[in-house]
């Protein structure tokens, strides 16, 4: 009978084992394992009858279409074999175990036990069949095994062979190389790759390809296993394979497949070409005069570009528009996209306009063109260049006019400060006792009205300030503080403050220019008090043209000292300039200024114990503050008075030679003007160059137009 | 002509609020300051502050800082003058005065319960 | 701030007849930068709105009688009505006009 085991392990006896087994038995015993697996069959007993080549009894183990083994008797012999120690290993998953007796046995034979069980195949080692095993990585596992890839590959749908995805290659480059996936490695198989060369129309693509050419072929049949097609529109090419490479091929067409196919067997290096766009030539072309074309080569085809640019000072000129370089193009038909432009040579042009200067040129007839040269100077002596550069400028190559130090900028013309262009005599009178100032003496003098029509009846009332710069005008801040407040200190709209500048006679403001303020800056810290700070300063709506009559004074160094002692100044103003008129005259006089023409006079520095002293020996809260000095003379009789306040009190300074602004004209005690021991009191203008120069956002000390240096 | 026009009187309870308009015309409103000033009954002259219009810029007088406001509408060249947390003796003609030279005919304000 | 006091506070004049009114202020109202005492008198008859007669101390405003007329400087000022009519009968007030501005407390004019 027949014994189906189907367990993964198990055990074999003979019949009544472990007693002796009967005669003229037969029993088989048909094992059945999963698939991945192998049984391994042995004995731990044997006993059975011996007989030449186990003609009597025996066991037999086999499989479907083979006997494995078959054994019988004690111990083996020539002619019979018992199993001992050896295991029976099936190569399948099936082993068949047979069993038989004869019908007599002259002695007790105890029979067999025998133990099976299923056992892992490897396959990744067994398989050595190329149809079976894995392409690339085999992975065996208990009962079974699988295939994997190396990078870039795809395992095929047979689970065995690695692949590419290569259908999808574009190549719209005129020049290009294309291989075999993994060139010059062997090509994967059950591969379909497509490559397609997509380019311009008017192109036409050449292959060609190289000495290593391997794809697997046959003897008798055309490539039945792997091939190149070269599809060119309706025509193709091929199939190619073998080891010789098919001879250049020019395709006519801009655009052209390549397929290549390739089965799940063989070992090939595969293939390699190179492309190229071949076009229609264009004819040759001339370099413009003054210029040049690049690429330079003996032959242009379809889709070449050349650059055409000019030498240094010149420009390409196409269509009357200026430029650096023109490009042309080889088009299909084989004619250039465009004429060779010309080069004309660079033109910088009339140069800017320098405020308050002048240019002059250096080359013949004028000319703007490359490496011509002008000249900027300023309009002296009322305006000097910033860092006294040299002006002079060259027309560069890039068509603009370029100067050593300052590149494209233009120079800067500063205000000349301090030089009148009437110089100041030594010999001079007073305010008080009155000496007429000529036009042109104090350049820099203002006079500033303020009108408050805010007010009904309008208050009026003026004072002196001097010009700092085309802008900006000092003064005291008592000037410019709105009358109308007790101790709050409140400047007056600048829409109310009116500046005449370059004025001699008030009676003719004609000649004269005049502005209104952008701003008012009164100094924060200004005490109406004591008048310490009193300082302040007027921006100009517009800038003031300089001349003979309207010039900046020089702002001082910056030094808590101030002028020296006995140190003679000048001041002008339009002041009250005689001692004798009563408040109830001024009053009655309106609100005209006091002298037609102004007026200076000339002062000595008194020393600050001085006049310290003098001031706080008289009833009254007076302060002469370190902000402020004294200047006049202890018998009296020359003196700044009411409506020079603000003016400038001025000192020649002996290196420059300039006429700096070391003082404004500030108070004065409660006498007469000119009185014996009442000096005038003055700002010291030393103690605020930083606070001035911050005020005008202008770096500090640059001279001219500024600080004296 | 120039003339600075009031509004009508006005009867308001203690702790109320009274707004009282200028309206100006026939000069330049915005460039002149106004000014403020009252009259209990039977007293002398009180001034309460200015605005400039034009800058909407203000001066008042400390004793009533905290409770009056000045405004002006340049667009109706008129300006208003707001007294808060009204008292009795807030009762008073108001004039606006244009900078000294010009006055309003004056708005009676009576703080009564 | 500056005070203002204004003496008689009441002044009964026959007709045609001089009358002076005093104002005295706690500082001095003489600015030397416009040159002007910043003080003005005002005439209010009853009824009505006051009236500018006087500015800064002695500047007659435009279509006042000349009869009236305003002198001083500094802390002393005087309006003077030389010869008085009916229709003057008013409370006349001083104001000094530095910020914040101050009126006397009026000074009444009746006929004697």
């Known amino acids: 009978h027949t014994v189906e085991l189907n367990d993964m392990f198990g055990q074999i006896q003979s019949p009544g084992y472990p007693d002796s087994y009967p005669s003229d038995s037969e029993v088989t015993w048909n094992i059945t394992v999963p698939d991945g697996f192998r049984i391994k069959l042995y004995f731990m007993h044997f006993n059975l009858e011996s007989s030449y080549l186990c003609e009597y009894d025996y066991v037999k183990v086999e499989t479907e279409d083979q006997v494995l083994a078959t054994f019988c008797g004690r111990e083996t012999t020539d002619t019979e074999q018992t199993p001992g120690q050896e295991v029976v290993l099936s190569p399948g998953s099936f082993m068949s175990i047979t069993f038989r007796s004869d019908f007599s046995n002259e002695e007790r034979f105890t029979g067999f036990d025998a133990h099976y069980m299923a056992v892992d195949v490897d396959e990744c080692k067994e398989r050595e069949d190329e149809e079976l095993s894995c392409d690339h990585y085999c992975h065996n596992y208990i009962g079974g095994y699988y295939c994997s890839c190396r990078f870039g590959y795809i395992l095929h749908t047979d689970n065995r062979t690695c692949r590419v995805e290569c259908s999808d290659n574009l190549f719209t480059q005129r020049t290009g190389v294309i291989t075999s996936p993994d060139f010059p490695n062997p090509y994967p198989k059950s591969s379909e790759c497509l490559y397609t060369i997509e380019l311009e129309e008017g192109f036409m693509v050449n292959l060609q390809f190289e000495d290593i050419f391997d794809i697997e072929d046959h003897p008798e049949v055309p490539c039945p296993y792997d091939y190149i097609k070269i599809k060119v529109g309706p025509k193709v090419l091929g199939p190619f394979c073998g080891e010789k490479a098919p001879e250049p091929i020019n395709t006519q067409s801009h655009s052209v497949l390549i397929l290549f196919h390739s089965d799940n067997s063989g070992e090939n290096r595969g293939w390699r070409l190179s492309y190229r766009a071949a076009g229609n030539e264009c004819p040759e072309l001339q370099p413009p005069v003054h210029g040049k074309i690049e690429p330079s080569q003996a032959k242009y085809s379809f889709k070449d570009q050349v650059l055409i640019s000019c030498d240094t000072g010149y420009k390409v000129l196409k269509d009357n528009v200026e430029m650096d370089t023109f490009q042309i193009e080889c088009l299909k038909d084989g004619t250039w996209s465009n004429k060779i432009p010309t080069c004309k040579i660079v033109d910088c042009r009339a140069p800017g306009e320098l405020e308050h200067g002048l240019v002059t040129f250096s080359t013949r007839n004028n000319l703007t063109t490359y490496k011509s040269e002008i000249r900027y100077s300023c309009q002296e002596p009322y305006y000097k260049m910033l860092n006294n550069i040299t002006g002079i400028y060259t027309c560069s190559a890039q068509g603009v006019w370029m100067n050593k130090v300052l590149g494209r900028s233009l120079p800067t013309c500063l205000p000349e400060c301090g030089q009148p262009s009437r110089s100041l005599p030594s010999l001079v009178k007073r305010i008080i006792g009155g000496r007429n100032a000529e036009p042109g003496l104090f350049p820099w003098q203002a006079l500033i009205v303020v009108e408050d029509t805010s007010r009904v009846p309008n208050d009026k009332w003026f004072g002196s300030g001097a010009l700092l710069s085309e802008s900006w005008i000092l003064t005291a801040a008592h000037v410019l503080r709105s009358q109308r407040r007790d101790t709050t200190v409140i400047p007056v709209s600048k829409e109310h403050v009116t500046v005449y500048l370059g004025l001699h006679d008030v009676r003719d403001k004609s000649g004269a220019v005049n502005s209104s303020a952008a701003r008012v800056v009164l100094h924060p810290d200004f005490n109406i008090q004591n008048y310490n700070h009193d300082i302040a300063l007027v921006q100009l709506q517009e800038p003031v043209p300089l001349g003979p009559h309207v010039m900046p004074v020089c702002l001082p160094r910056l030094e808590p000292e101030g002028p020296s002692p006995h140190m003679l100044g000048l001041v002008a103003g339009w002041g009250i300039s005689n001692p004798n008129v009563t408040v109830d005259e001024i009053i009655s006089s309106g609100t005209r200024t006091l002298s037609d023409v102004l007026q200076y006079v000339k002062l000595p520095v008194v020393p600050h114990a001085e006049c310290k002293t003098s001031y706080e020996s008289r009833s009254g809260n007076y302060s002469v503050t370190e902000n402020m000095f004294c200047a006049g003379y202890y018998e009296g009789g020359k003196d700044t008075c009411l409506g020079d306040s603000g003016g400038a009190f001025v000192i020649l300074d002996d290196l420059s030679q300039r006429w700096v602004v070391q003082g404004l004209v500030s108070w004065g005690g409660p006498e007469e003007c000119g009185s014996k021991q009442v000096y005038g009191v003055y700002t010291k203008v030393s103690n605020y160059v930083d606070w001035v120069w911050e005020q005008m956002g202008s770096p500090q000390g640059r001279a001219p137009g500024g600080t004296v240096s | 002509q120039v003339q600075l026009v009031q509004s009508g009187a006005e009867v308001k309870k203690p702790g109320a609020s009274v707004k009282v308009s200028c309206k100006a015309s026939g000069y330049t409103f915005t460039g002149k300051w106004i000014e403020w000033v009252r009259q209990a009954p039977g007293q002398g002259l009180e001034w309460m502050g200015e605005?400039?219009?034009?800058?909407?810029?203000?001066d008042y007088n400390e004793r009533f800082k905290d409770r009056v406001t000045f405004t002006a509408d340049t667009s109706t060249s008129t300006v208003y003058m707001e007294l808060s947390s009204l008292r009795s003796e807030d009762t008073a003609v108001y004039y606006c005065?244009?900078?000294?030279?010009?006055w309003g005919q004056g708005t009676l304000v009576t703080v009564s319960s | 701030d500056i005070v203002m006091t204004q003496s008689p506070d009441s002044l009964a004049v026959s007709l045609g007849e001089r009358a002076t009114i005093n104002c005295k202020s706690s500082?001095?109202?003489?600015?030397?930068?416009?040159?002007?005492?910043?003080l003005a008198w005002f005439q209010q008859k009853p009824g009505q709105s006051p009236k500018l007669l006087i500015y800064?101390?002695?500047t007659r405003e435009s279509g006042v009688p000349d009869r009236f007329s305003g002198s001083g400087s500094g802390t002393d000022f005087t309006l003077t009505i030389s010869s008085l009519q009916a229709e003057d009968v008013a409370v006349y007030y001083c104001?000094?006009?530095?910020?914040?501005?101050?009126f006397g407390g009026g000074t009444k004019v009746e006929i004697k």
């Open positions: 104001k000094q006009s530095y910020i914040p501005f101050t």
């Open positions: 005065v244009r900078s000294e030279d010009l």
């Open positions: 605005i400039l219009p034009g800058s909407g810029s203000t």
């Open positions: 500082q001095n109202l003489f600015n030397s930068r416009t040159r002007k005492n910043y």
């Open positions: 800064w101390a002695s």
